[in-house]
Interface confidence: low
């Protein structure tokens, strides 16, 4: 599966859940940057 990065968390989604399901370090970095930038 492939996650597109986005600027907001889905319902019940957390950085931890993303971390647990992300398939690569690259994907984690993409998520992290956009989530932090949206705060």
């Amino acid at each position: 599966k492939h996650k597109c990065f986005r600027k907001e968390l889905e319902e019940n989604e957390t950085l931890e859940s993303i971390m647990n399901t992300a398939e690569s370090e690259e994907e984690l970095k993409k998520y992290f940057y956009y989530l932090e930038g949206s705060k």
Epitope: L15, E16, M19, N20, E25, E26, L28, K29, Y33, E36
Partner: antibody
């Protein structure tokens, strides 16, 4: 105030075990990833291990994988490093360090403990 | 693993003068999708733990004097102290957090000339 207070260092024989502790205060401990970083006497910094805010995800340097275990008790605001099968080359000051963020990423450290000396010698 | 190499190993600078420390990574720490460099700088004084100065290669940590600045991208980075003060005598380390294991440079000792 915001701080990390370390304990548990000391002298241990090669092959022995030791547990380091790092008590956090002044911030919501469970919200942040934590790491251990060590510094051999007169040498540079070496990252050892990291753990996510929930404790579900752990990461290790190759030099300690299988011998060291990082853990945390968020109810006690405390980080641990269990060190087994210690070697002379593990002799160092061990620092606990706080990541500014809750996941493993991005991996830099904005708050450090004062360090605790671990000496492995017979 | 990504290797970090600093230069010089030590430097002596007169008070009020500029100090420049270089850091080179063995592979790029620039993540193209967000155009961020995964690099931090720390200051360590004798008998003390390291102190975060700069992250994302150029973002100054809160409370750090503006005489400290970071620059560079990809594999080549620089920490600049624009006007050296006596309290800046320390060892400075770069660190990459692009991938685990996180790795540090060997350190650069800054002294007063």
């Amino acid at each position: 105030q915001v701080q990390l207070v370390q304990s548990g260092g000391g002298l241990v024989q090669p092959g022995g075990s030791l547990r380091l502790s790092c008590a956090a205060s002044g911030f919501t401990f469970s919200n942040y990833a934590m790491s251990w970083v060590r510094q051999a006497p007169g040498k540079g910094l070496e990252w050892v291990s990291a753990i996510s805010g929930s404790g579900d995800n752990t990461y290790y340097a190759d030099s300690v994988r299988g011998r060291f275990t990082i853990s945390r008790d968020n109810s006690k605001n405390t980080l641990y490093l269990q060190m087994n099968s210690l070697r002379a080359e593990d002799t160092a000051i061990y620092y606990c360090a706080k990541d500014p963020h809750s996941s493993r990423w991005p991996g830099f450290f904005d708050l450090w403990g004062r360090g605790t000396l671990v000496t492995v010698s017979s | 693993d990504i290797q970090m190499t600093q230069s010089p190993d030590s430097l002596a600078v007169s008070l009020g003068e500029r100090a420049t420390i270089n850091c080179k990574s063995s592979q790029s720490v620039l993540y193209s999708s967000n155009n961020q460099n995964y690099l931090a700088w720390y200051q360590q004084k004798p008998g003390q733990p390291p102190k975060l100065l700069i992250y994302w290669a150029s973002t100054r940590e809160s409370g750090v004097p503006d005489r400290f600045s970071g620059s560079g991208s990809g594999t080549d980075f620089t920490l600049t102290i624009s006007s050296l003060q006596a309290e800046d005598v320390a060892v400075y380390y770069c660190q990459q957090y692009y991938s685990t294991p996180y790795t540090f440079g060997q350190g650069t000792k800054v002294e007063i000339k």
